[in-house]
């Protein structure tokens, strides 16, 4: 007789999840010599231990502590790039500008990027059928708690000038309900962070509006200023040219506004 299984509203664990995490860990440690000491099997065991046999609506930050201990990593605090709703461009940027880091450029962020996972209470099984949806089921699910935890710590680690890439094509360029708006903004440390610099990425080729005047950007400025952190904003009118100029800053066309 098949066991009754909880049906959640969200998609189930990404197929081949254990193999994917392990393979990503091995790849990351090969690419980053400073992380060569990491034992990927232990990393997987700690990752698994965070959610296996636990109710997927009852996950806590503490569940991820063993994983974070194994994922110990040093990133220069003044080279942090946050992003909201524009992940691909942010990652393209840090692939070129190698001394800057998004959360997904860290080992833990790289392991979990774009994956879904959850277990079941009192069984060692991974649930490949469904996982809790943040809105419809519960917020303390394995994926949400993971990203909230690492996003908070990443923001707390930032210092000096922190950059954030925002999507100028969205109706809410700054969204208070995004991870950036609900977690990262509130965990920047005013004793360490002098300025938050927003880069608003334009979508349309002929879009010459100053999106730094957008009401949601003004809202972000207000939140940041109240936290005793300076705010600045730049329009990136041509993201393609922007990336090209990061690759080739000497190019003569790169002196004009991008």
């Amino acid at each position: 007789v098949p066991r009754w299984r909880q049906q959640w509203s969200g998609p189930g664990t990404t197929k081949r999840f254990p193999e994917t995490v392990l393979a990503r860990c091995v790849k990351y440690t090969e690419i980053h010599p400073e992380m060569r000491h990491v034992d990927c099997q232990s990393v997987w065991d700690a990752f698994k231990g965070a959610f296996i046999s636990k109710h997927p609506c009852n996950i806590t930050e503490e569940d991820y502590q063993p994983l974070m201990k194994l994922g110990t990593q040093t990133v220069p605090c003044n080279k942090i790039l946050l992003w909201s709703r524009i992940k691909d461009l942010a990652h393209q940027f840090t692939q070129v500008q190698r001394d800057m880091f998004t959360l997904e450029d860290t080992l833990l962020g790289y392991l979990a990027d774009d994956l879904t996972w959850c277990g079941e209470f009192n069984t060692s099984k991974i649930n490949y059928q469904s996982c809790p949806d943040w809105r419809k089921d519960c917020s303390n699910n394995p994926v949400s708690v993971f990203w909230k935890t690492v996003s908070r710590r990443f923001a707390e680690a930032a210092c000096d000038v922190v950059h954030v890439m925002l999507n100028g094509s969205r109706s809410k360029i700054f969204d208070k309900n995004s991870t950036f708006g609900s977690v990262e903004v509130h965990n920047l440390q005013p004793e360490k962070v002098q300025t938050l610099e927003a880069w608003v990425i334009h979508g349309g080729r002929e879009d010459s509006r100053d999106l730094c005047q957008d009401p949601t950007i003004k809202e972000l400025e207000s939140i940041i200023s109240k936290r005793n952190i300076q705010f600045s904003c730049k329009n990136i009118y041509r993201p393609d040219k922007f990336l090209q100029c990061v690759k080739n800053p000497e190019d003569s066309s790169c002196t004009s506004e991008i």
């Epitope: 990593q73 040093t74 605090c77 680690a157 005013p190």
Partner: nanobody
Framework: QVKLEESGGGLVQAGGSLRLSCVAS????????MGWYRQAPGKQRELVAT???????NYTDSVKGRFTISRDNAKNTVYLQMNSLKPEDTAVYYC???????????????WGQGTQVTVAS
């Protein structure tokens, strides 16, 4: 791990000046507050001055107007310029730094070995 190394101590006449330096070395994510503390023989260690990463300073009353703390974030270094020195400033001066070694972990306090400052009357 992290090493804090002080330099610049020595023997000076009352009314003279000294400049202490302290550099933090190791693999560091960030240093929040850096500071100087001192301990005179038979006394408890006491705060002299602190400075945040953004340059906010704090001094103990007895050194205000005479000592100046500064730092170079890029070099993970803190300085203490001591002017108009008095015999009561004689002590071992210790550097302190609140260092974060790992992006996922909290910052911890680290201390230097200390440098002797002697002010002769």
């Amino acid at each position: 791990q992290v090493k804090l190394e002080e330099s610049g101590g020595g023997l000076v006449q009352a009314g003279g000046s000294l400049r202490l330096s302290c550099v933090a070395s190791g693999t560091i994510v960030s240093i929040s507050t850096m500071g100087w503390y001192r301990q005179a023989p038979g006394k408890q260690r006491e705060l002299v001055a602190t400075i945040t990463r953004r340059g906010r300073t704090n001094y103990t009353d007895s050194v205000k107007g005479r000592f100046t703390i500064s730092r170079d974030n890029a070099k993970n270094t803190v300085y203490l310029q001591m002017n108009s020195l008095k015999p009561e400033d004689t002590a071992v001066y210790y550097c302190n730094a609140e260092v974060q070694l790992d992006i996922w972990a909290s910052a911890y306090d680290y201390w230097g070995q200390g440098t002797q400052v002697t002010v002769a009357s």
